[in-house]
Interface confidence: low
Amino acid sequence: CSCAPTHPQTAFCNSDLVIRAKFMGSPEIIETTLYQRYEIKMTKMLKGFDAVGNATGFRFAYTPAMESLCGYVHKSQNRSEEFLIAGRLRNGNLHITACSFLVPWHNLSPAQQKAFVKTYSAGCGVCTVFPCSAIPCKLESDSHCLWTDQILMGSEKGYQSDHFACLPRNPDLCTWQYLGVSMTRSLPLAKAEA
């Protein structure tokens, strides 16, 4: 399957549901459809409270049954491993594909973990992470943040992806904002004596 690179914030904002969950076993093929489903155990919901309503959780994640049509294949055998799943809601069910943002929770940087819980939501609907995959590329709007990891790092997993979110600076402007404590080391409080 060929997926467009996605910044974690884009994945968060464009998903109906973002949850932490564990995969409980092998997929089950659903007769008469081209889907299969994985049984999952949801541990935390990070986005989708409004869409879900009173539902206590999702027992299954549905995906196309064929890899050639971008079906997700879960490789880990570790049932205790927790995953971040950014998926879509279809007919009340959680749907994922090979292009879904779906990674072990512990693989996310601490900054990303914090952002999925709290920060990314502030940029949704207001700011857009705009991928720059070839030079030259330019900002098309003040609400865009230019994502250059693919060019500078040769990968979608780069500094902007790991440590930054595109957030409103004022009502008309979005900028990259650092997800950590500070970009610079704190200066020594006392000067050395001459």
Epitope: C1, S2, T6, N14, Y35, R88, H95, C99
Partner: antibody, heavy 121, light 109 residues
Framework: QVQLVQSGAEVKKPGESLKISCKGS????????IGWVRQMPGKGLEWMGI????????RYSPSFQGQVTISADKSISTAYLQWSSLKASDTAMYYC??????????????WGQGTLVTVSS | DIALTQPASVSGSPGQSITISCTGT?????????VSWYQQHPGKAPKLMIY???NRPSGVSNRFSGSKSGNTASLTISGLQAEDEADYYC?????????FGGGTKLTVL
């Protein structure tokens, strides 16, 4: 070379049934999806559904689910599109197309010549 | 199904370059590198011109090129020729659904 040959034009009355065909040759018919696409007079292309002749797995567009049936007979390398009860709004050109779908490629690379279906009382 | 958005018509003179846009969502055009472009002359079947955003099938002129930025894909035809006059359709993919654009009529002046 890859060829998809469709059955000839049809003129039908509302309420009648119809089955049109698409015969593939020049490639392994059971190894590729076949899609059906509708084009109403003067309008654009609309994807209706796909079938994998190897095992007859079928997927429909929500717009066409329950309106048509897609099937295939792999022994004669032929895919079918059928209606149980035609409506005037089914008047259109219908194309079959081979879907290359695997790995990093996904496209309808070869098309049939089209079957014109006219439904009129 | 929501069709991808294309301009209804574009035009250009012989030798010029034109670009046709195709706007979708983060789920289809933006989510996968699966955008195809088809050319259709009146009374003929569609013909594949570009696949996987920017790849040309063998036999298609290198005057045709494709690209994508965000949720918008583009087809560019350089050195416009009379035989390029036709309808052009983009097509993308989203979770086992295939969606076409509304089509763009290209007129060579």
């Amino acid at each position: 070379q890859v060829q998809l040959v469709q059955s000839g034009a049809e003129v039908k009355k509302p309420g009648e049934s119809l089955k049109i065909s698409c015969k593939g040759s020049g490639y392994s018919f059971t190894s590729y999806w076949i899609g059906w696409v509708r084009q109403m007079p003067g309008k654009g292309l609309e994807w209706m559904g796909i079938i994998y002749p190897g095992d007859s797995d079928t997927r429909y567009s929500p717009s066409f689910q329950g309106q048509v049936t897609i099937s295939a007979d792999k022994s004669i390398s032929t895919a079918y599109l059928q209606w149980s009860s035609l409506k005037a709004s089914d008047t259109a050109m219908y194309y079959c197309a081979r879907l290359v779908g695997g790995g990093y490629d996904l496209m309808f690379d070869s098309w049939g010549q089209g079957t014109l279906v006219t439904v009129s009382s | 199904d929501i069709a991808l958005t294309q301009p209804a018509s574009v035009s250009g003179s012989p030798g010029q370059s034109i670009t046709i846009s195709c706007t979708g969502t983060s789920s289809d055009v933006g989510g996968y590198n699966y955008v195809s472009w088809y050319q259709q002359h009146p009374g003929k079947a569609p013909k594949l011109m570009i696949y996987d955003v920017s790849n040309r099938p063998s036999g298609v002129s290198n005057r045709f090129s494709g690209s994508k930025s965000g949720n918008t894909a583009s087809l560019t035809i350089s050195g416009l020729q009379a035989e390029d006059e036709a309808d052009y359709y983009c097509q993308s993919y989203d979770d086992m659904q295939f969606v076409f654009g509304g089509g763009t009529k290209l007129t060579v002046l």
